[in-house]
């Protein structure tokens, strides 16, 4: 019903998200040289971060390196860091893949393994795979409420995706509940043909597209959102190109008057909300 | 080869960045009343923050105020805060440039210098210049990998800037390696005619533009990114207008059950990634 | 004076904001069972976060739950969590509104109130209203400097909203000072017909629109910003749909080698800066 000669206006949009859910996490710790499982509960403040813009992030997996301090220590053993004598190490060298600056000495890492010594945050983070299954695998049951207020300033018209009378215990479904603004994370992945549990291991980027199809004429007035989903990261990436989505962050603290940190390599899903559409009017 | 009557489509884009590099930082401490340099190593978790959207940030310089707690103390001496008697201070006054609320008393700061007393996080942050050279001056050797997946939904066409077979030890060069998605920070600045070491002192904003020039016709198909760079902040700013790019953040901790904080004024480069382009098709 | 046959170019924009101001906050604490008011001073590092993109956030209110640790404890009493026997609780159940995982036991919360026991960060956050008036109600006197550099790449033309000779002690006023880039937060709300003190309680989202009206022809050259404001969140939201703007974050620390956290529910204003406009040229 939109006419070609209608005036089309871009949309001004504001997005606010609320993630809900808790996850039971089974972490492996070492106590007196024995591996042991401890249970923790992760809530919103633990797994999501106050994000800006049209994005939110949910942590699905992690690797921790506890009790790091600035000192000298051997590099974690890899093909690049193993050595047999000081000749294999170069004082002042910073390997782009390394986490420290070489002292020029080749020292014992463990047993008969020797690696180049570095000045760094020690002990050095291990080079290891993300846990399988993902520690917050149950995040697929988390839900996100998306509040989207839009504005066609040229038409002086404002609306929003949550209208009075909405049953807020709803969950979005493409056919049975296409206007519900509460999305189960696992369902979003099902819609794009992806498996949440697989993506949760390494992380990824998921697009939530909100298309506003609006005819602002009095006679044919309609203006409501259509939700669709699109996997935005690359599913099949060479391991050397950092597949998935992860970043490192540190929790700093003082112990015995010395600054220490816990380094956390966080894997998770970044959800990008893309709002577009036009408002046509004579 | 693009025809005027081709259908042009806007691009949907997703960006993910990975910064690599370590910096040796020489911090000044006071030992026995004598200033002394100590070395620290800064890695990704120390100098960059998990960013959303199409931005990433690299810290290049900083000023620290350690051991602050909420109490009464004299303001840091400046023309605005010096006083000779209580008449020069106003109880309850909050100067926009100040960091505390005046008590109305004029007290000794040091020697014969007197300033207005305030309730604040004390000791008050000093009004001082950013260190020269920048403490993380060596950040110019850091590299950033930019992963950009794009989508022309109207044409049901998806591609990305990293194609199979890419040599990931490459570094971008305008003529010799224009498709390499790994950028040395110093090179980006060289491209815009700026000197990284200068900008690193006060910080700045740098644009990385990715222009997708795509013809999606079967016959003339081409679709690849062109990278260009643009300094986005203002190089020549009046000092009163906060040149560069900086912000303050705090690390909170408890000591003897009292909340304390380390205040850090962080200077650095915010990189904004701007993705644009159109896909033409009959 | 713009001609229809001028070539119109979109704008590339970079935004940098600086918030200034301090707030005196009166927090209620309980000491030996007695409620007591303590005064604190909040400065930029306490109430704002280093934000990316075209957004900044100012905390205006908060609720704290101190000394949480992972253990078993009774849920906070609400209609959903009250119980009279273990039959009212279900082992392993995670209520989406809850903060923990039920153990299956019904235990005493206080007096004769019993609730389902959970494994969680304990003590559980209370379900309570945001403080009235807002704890950082005085944030309406904070100011924000907005630096906006723009670029019409097609015309090779760059400008910015802060020109030499600007009196930087100015404050924006729609008629008396429409080019001043320093905005008092309370004034922004007055412009949109909102009351800062009301919005500060629950938080909200405010749009700052910068429209660049530019004619880049030599003869009719003009290019300057017009500032306008638009409330972006929904003023009249059903309480079940999370009115306002808030998020939770945690400050983690160690006590006697046990990880603890202070949970903070932060309410505040997110300011979204929307830059648009076109540059016309023959």
């Amino acid at each position: 019903s939109d006419k070609l000669y209608q005036r089309k206006e871009p949309v001004i949009s504001s997005v606010h998200t609320k993630v809900k859910g808790i996850a039971e996490v089974k972490e492996e710790i070492v106590e007196n040289g024995v591996k042991k499982l401890v249970h923790s509960v992760f809530d919103t403040a633990d797994y999501t971060f106050p994000l800006q813009g049209n994005s939110f992030f949910v942590m699905t997996n992690f690797l921790k390196t506890e009790g790091q301090e600035q000192r000298l220590c051997p590099e974690y053993p890899t093909r690049r860091t193993l050595c047999s004598s000081d000749r294999g190490c170069k004082k002042g060298w910073m390997d782009p893949q390394s986490k420290g600056i070489q002292t020029g000495r080749c020292v014992v890492y463990e047993g008969n393994q020797k690696t180049c010594e570095v000045s760094a945050w020690c002990p050095i983070e291990a080079v290891e795979e993300a846990p399988r299954p993902a520690l917050l695998n149950s995040a697929e049951n988390f839900t996100v409420l998306i509040k989207n207020n839009i504005d066609f300033p040229g038409h002086n018209y404002t609306t929003r995706n949550i209208l009075p009378g909405l049953n807020i215990t709803c969950t979005f479904h493409k056919t049975q509940n296409p206007q519900c603004p509460i999305f189960r994370l696992g369902d979003i992945f099902r819609e794009t043909g992806d498996n949440f549990s697989d993506v949760a291991i390494q992380g990824g980027i998921m697009g939530i597209e909100i298309y506003w199809d609006c005819n602002l004429d009095r006679w044919f007035h309609h203006c409501h959102p259509k939700y669709s989903f699109r996997r935005l990261d690359d599913k099949t990436t060479n391991v050397s190109l950092y597949p998935g989505y992860n970043f490192r962050y540190a929790k700093y603290y003082k112990e015995n008057n010395v600054e220490k940190r816990t380094l956390i390599k966080v894997f998770g899903i970044r959800f990008d909300i893309l709002v577009f559409g036009t408002g046509g009017k004579f | 080869s693009d025809k005027l009557y081709q259908r042009k489509e806007p691009v949907i884009s997703s960006v993910h960045t990975k910064v690599k590099g370590i910096a040796e930082v020489k911090e000044e401490i006071v030992e026995n009343g004598v200033k002394k340099l100590v070395h620290s190593v800064f890695d990704t978790a120390d100098y960059t923050f998990p960013l959303q959207g199409n931005s990433f940030f690299v810290m290049t310089n900083f000023l620290k105020t350690e051991g602050q707690e909420q109490r009464l103390c004299p303001e840091y001496p400046t023309r605005r805060t010096l006083c000779s008697s209580d008449r020069g201070c106003k109880k309850g006054w909050m100067d926009p440039q100040s960091k505390g609320i005046q008590t109305g008393r004029c007290v000794v700061y040091e020697g014969n210098q007197k300033t207005c007393e305030v309730s604040a996080w004390c000791p008050i942050e000093a009004v001082e210049e950013a260190p020269r050279p920048a403490l993380l001056n060596s950040a110019e050797n850091f590299t950033v990998l930019i992963k950009n997946n794009i989508d022309f939904p109207g044409h049901n066409y998806t591609t990305r800037n990293i194609l199979p077979g890419l040599n990931i030890t490459c570094t971008f060069h305008k003529t010799q390696n224009p498709q390499c998605p790994i950028f040395r920070l110093g090179d980006i600045f060289r491209e815009t005619g700026d000197n990284f070491s200068d900008v690193a002192i006060q910080g700045g904003i740098m644009g990385i533009e990715i222009y997708w020039d795509c013809n999606l016709d079967r016959w003339f198909h081409h679709c690849h990114p062109k990278y260009s760079f643009r300094r986005l902040d203002d190089k020549t700013t009046n000092v009163s207008l906060y040149p560069g790019y900086n912000f303050r953040y705090a690390k909170y901790y408890k000591e003897n059950n009292v909340e304390k904080r380390t205040l850090i004024k962080v200077f650095g480069i915010r990189f904004d990634i701007l993705v644009f382009g159109t896909g033409g098709k009959f | 004076s713009d001609k229809l046959y001028q070539r119109k170019e979109p704008v590339i924009s970079s935004v940098h904001t600086k918030v200034k101001g301090i707030a005196e906050v009166k927090e209620e604490i309980v000491e030996n069972g007695v409620k007591k008011l303590v005064h604190s001073v909040f400065d930029t590092a306490d109430y704002t976060f280093p934000l990316q993109g075209n957004s900044f956030f100012v905390m205006t209110n908060f609720l704290k739950t101190e000394g949480q640790e992972q253990r078993l404890c009774p849920e906070y009493p609400t209609r959903r969590t009250l119980c009279s026997s273990d039959r009212g609780c279900k082992k392993g159940w995670m209520d989406p509104q809850s903060k923990g995982i039920q153990t299956g036991r019904c235990v005493v919360y206080e007096g004769n109130q019993k609730t389902c026991e959970v494994s969680a960060w304990c003590p559980i956050e209370a379900v309570e209203e945001a403080p009235r008036p807002a704890l950082l109600n005085s944030a309406e006197n904070f100011t924000v400097l907005i630096k906006n550099n723009i670029d019409f790449p097609g015309h090779n033309y760059t400008t910015r909203n802060i020109l030499p000779g600007l009196n930087i002690t100015c404050t924006f006023h729609k008629t008396q000072n429409p080019q001043c880039p320093i905005f008092r937060l309370g004034d922004i709300f007055r412009e949109t017909g909102d009351n800062f003190s009301d919005v500060a309680i629950q938080g909200g989202i405010m749009g700052i629109e910068i429209y660049w009206d530019c004619n880049l022809d030599r003869w009719f050259h003009h290019c300057h910003p017009k500032y306008s404001f638009r409330r972006l969140d929904d003023k009249t939201t059903n309480v079940s749909l999370y009115p306002g703007y808030n998020f939770r974050y945690a400050k983690y620390y160690k006590e006697n080698n046990v990880e603890k956290r202070t949970l903070i529910k932060v309410f505040g204003i997110r300011f979204d800066i929307l830059v648009f406009g076109t540059g016309g040229k023959f």
Partner: nanobody, 118 residues
Framework: EVQLVESGGGLVQPGGSLTLSCAAS????????MSWHRQAPGKQRTLVAD???????EYEDSVKGRFTISRDNFKNTMTLHMNSLKPEDTAVYFC????????????WGQGTQVTVSS
């Protein structure tokens, strides 16, 4: 002026215990790795135990399980608890300090004599 002062040495019987202390002044103690070294008559000085500012410890093989090094960064002190002492532990024990990223020590104490004999 930098000073490292050792105390606690003395005569002890085999199987006995002793605690050595080292008090530091004039250095930013929490930036220094501290160590104990020993020198038996007519022999080279050797490393016994080392502790980083944050408490990471390393021991020479012959003392593992018998000696414990610790430090207090508020009091600027370091201690060495020595148990199950043997005659071959007899030596002058030196306290040393090195900046956390240095390979060799910057400062040394004067030493304290430990004699293990029946």
């Amino acid at each position: 002026e930098v000073q490292l002062v050792e105390s606690g040495g003395g005569l002890v019987q085999p199987g006995g215990s002793l605690t050595l202390s080292c008090a530091a002044s004039g250095i930013a103690f929490n930036y220094y790795s501290m160590s104990w070294h020993r020198q038996a008559p007519g022999k080279q000085r050797t490393l016994v135990a080392d502790i980083s500012p944050g408490g990471h410890t390393e021991y020479e093989d012959s003392v593992k399980g018998r000696f414990t090094i610790s430090r207090d960064n508020f009091k600027n002190t370091m201690t060495l608890h020595m148990n199950s002492l043997k005659p071959e532990d007899t030596a002058v024990y030196f306290c040393a300090a090195r900046l956390r990223f240095e390979v060799s020590s910057n400062y040394w104490g004067q030493g304290t004599q430990v004699t293990v004999s029946s």
